[in-house]
Interface confidence: medium
């Protein structure tokens, strides 16, 4: 079952002659990313990022496309013809293929400057709102804890006399995106939860993601 989701930079605008970063992020899955393909609106491949073999920028775009940051792509010296859809395709094992869409609008310099002037205060306002929400959340959490500690203290003597050895379990809910709760995250290894023989498979040089004859399967030839 494909549990992952692709988050993209969505609809973006940039000025003619400038550069822009196209970014896709695969989340909510432990699947291994074997390859990311970047395609243009006419479905021509711009670039490929293979987990083991690295980047390949297609010759037609070598002068204006730079790999990264991360699995993203940087388009440089933008022209009006660059306006349109861009797709990132994540080939993963064992999930299969995920696809994200970005719409890029290249604007004449003056229009882009106007939109940038409008965007900066908007971003500032959003940041301020986020700070206010964070403070509110912290205050609520602190007050709740104080209230709880008072309640616990009042029944402490009763608990000491009637101890069952059981602990109250507080179910933890996952934090929503953008929330201010910080959890200490253990870095996932290259293979996520996998161990043993097939764990080394992300290090393989040669694999195939086959669609037509065998469905979305990935094939690896291991080095070892």
């Amino acid at each position: 079952m494909m549990t992952g989701t692709i988050e993209t930079t969505g609809n973006i605008s940039a000025k003619k002659g400038g550069s822009v970063i196209l970014q896709c992020h695969l989340s909510s899955t432990m699947a291994q990313v074997t390859q990311v393909n970047w395609e243009q609106h006419d479905h021509s491949l711009l670039a490929i990022r293979n987990a083991e073999l690295g980047w390949h920028i297609y010759p037609a775009f070598k002068d204006r496309v730079a790999p990264g940051p991360g699995l993203g792509l940087t388009l440089q010296s933008l022209t009006m013809n660059d306006t349109g859809e861009y797709f990132c395709t994540y080939h993963t094992y064992p999930d299969g293929t995920y696809r994200g869409r970005i719409f890029l609008e290249v604007l004449e310099s003056s229009v882009a400057e106007h939109s940038a002037r409008f965007q900066i205060p908007l971003l500032g306002a959003m940041a301020m709102m986020l700070v206010v929400i964070c403070i509110a959340v912290i205050v609520v959490v602190v007050l709740a804890r104080k209230k709880k500690s008072l309640r616990i203290h009042s029944v402490e003597s009763g608990l000491q006399r009637k101890s069952t050895g059981q602990e109250e379990q507080i179910p933890s809910a996952p934090s929503p995106p953008g929330s201010c709760v910080q959890a200490e995250a253990a870095p996932a290894g290259l293979c996520g939860e996998q161990q043993g023989d097939d764990c080394a498979e992300l290090h393989d040089y040669f694999n195939v993601l086959s669609y037509r004859s065998l469905g979305s399967c990935s094939f690896f030839t291991e080095t070892g």
């Epitope: 094992y93 040669f206 094939f219 030839t221």
Partner: antibody, heavy 125, light 112 residues
Amino acid sequence: QVQLVQSGAEVKKPGSSVKVSCKASGGTFLSSAISWVRQAPGQGLEWMGSIIPLFGKANYAQKFQGRVTITADESTSTAYMELSSLRSEDTAVYYCARGPSEVKGILGYVWFDPWGQGTLVTVSS
Amino acid sequence: DIVMTQSPLSLPVTPGEPASISCRSSQSLLHSNGYNYLDWYLQKPGQSPQLLIYLGSNRASGVPDRFSGSGSGTDFTLKISRVEAEDVGVYYCMQARRIPITFGGGTKVEIK
């Protein structure tokens, strides 16, 4: 229909090098793995190494490491296998073969199909 | 390296009769994706090898349905339901599970 056409037979002296070419027509050269397999007279098949032209990165059998170089030229859809420090035991038919490919996906040499017609390399003083 | 052992070395057959070739690997060729990384090739006299079966049991395009591949893990079998004169040659199994890729020693099929 993909076809692989190899260069002609070669006679070489011990200690010299040989470079065999394999030209692909039809299909997608860039994202297909090209592998080299040799067969000594009356013997079985022996994998030497492979390359995916798209990335230009080759992988070799330990036995040939340091003596074999596999390259690919995108512009002519041709792969090459160069074997140096030749000895009489290197007398064999050298085959190139293509691995499965998907233009949008990738890659591999999980099976070999098709094969070139073979190139006989004779090493003799 | 994974060692591939084929048997028999030579197989005399009668046209119209079935034939079977065995291939054993020193390590499992079964991947966690459920596929066995084993292929079968036929090399007819004076020709290049040709793919018959890939990933254990998938017939390559253009291969007659009298050829079938089976097995999993370390034991594999190529079966020819009714041998025809054109089936003579040397049959090889090949593992693609790990680098280096290795071939079996070959089984020579000839008409009795």
